[in-house]
């Protein structure tokens, strides 16, 4: 039975040209995290594997930095980066947990962070 929950940074906004940390946290389970996939729609950004380290998709290698932790730092933001991002936690023995973050990249200098929220 899957008892865990994914806590994410929720809806966030950032300025064009800036950077943002995409962060998820798995709680309420003792399951072992074996891999985390970071995806934007159907496009892979990166994979963090517990044994192997990080695989950064070549399309993003100049703009994506691993971490902190299992999170991902997205740099040199453009308006085209606006959209949904997903952290997919592969765990043993529970299975897969998915968290969602919505990022809005703003032209203006006013970029406020949204509240944290949970996805069961």
């Amino acid at each position: 039975m899957m008892t865990g929950t994914i806590e994410t940074t929720g809806n966030i906004s950032a300025e064009k040209g800036g950077s943002i940390i995409l962060q998820c946290h798995l709680s309420s389970t003792t399951a072992q995290v074996t891999q985390v996939n970071w995806e934007q729609q159907d496009q892979l950004l990166a994979i963090c594997n517990a044994d192997l380290g990080w695989h950064i998709s070549p399309s993003f290698k100049d703009r994506v930095a691993p971490g902190p932790g299992l999170g991902l730092t997205l740099q040199s933001l453009t308006v085209n980066d606006t959209g949904e991002y997903f952290c997919i936690y592969h765990t043993y023995p529970d299975g897969t947990y998915t968290g969602r973050i919505f990022l809005e990249v703003l032209e203006s200098s006013v970029a406020e962070h949204g509240a944290r929220f949970q996805i069961p």
Partner: antibody, heavy 127, light 107 residues
Amino acid sequence: QVQLQESGPGLVKPSQTLSLTCTVSGGSISSVYFYWNWIRQHPGKGLEWIGYIYYSGGTYYNPSLRSRVTISVDTSKNQFSLKLNSVTAADTAVYYCARGSIAAGGGYFYYNDMDVWGQGTTVTVSS
Amino acid sequence: EIVLTQSPDFQSVTPKEKVAITCRASQSIGSSLHWYQQKPDQSPKPLIKYVSQSFSGVPSRFSGSGSGTDFTLTINSLEAEDAATYYCHQSSSLPLTFGGGTKVEIK
């Protein structure tokens, strides 16, 4: 010498689930530097990658099939499996399992070639 | 996803002739390009990895070259047993992809 062998029903009815297993012999599926793939080939056509699984359970699926695919691993049996649900005639194909190797270092890893392939199993979707 | 375009689709060649098959990637894949040979009713057999590294047991008449987006598989002095379909494959970026294949027929 590592060998891979696909097994499963050769005939599946439309809307049902296709289930195949790949048995690894001559080596351990739990090796850190390998990933385990499913590939299919429609009659007279090219190769289509379905997805992979790592021994510890991490997966990545082809986005074109993701909504219908599950790949799982059983390290105790040295096997990994494919489930493809809601099949149609368009899923009729030869299904292959294959071992891919991984290069790792400096905190990063990369996918290499697929060096060992099963002989393939034909799956027909028909009522 | 990275699209691999092979050309030609089909080639009819006389024995001892030289064959060149090209594979073009829709974006740079560095050297993460591999070649497979598939004969009728058989599974693909690895030929060359990382552009130019031959697998063990592969005859020396098979060679590979290229980098970035343009790659070539060359068969020097074709033999009858080389009749097959040849596929390129990239492992640079997920999803992994294959070229559409080049069928080589012996005249």
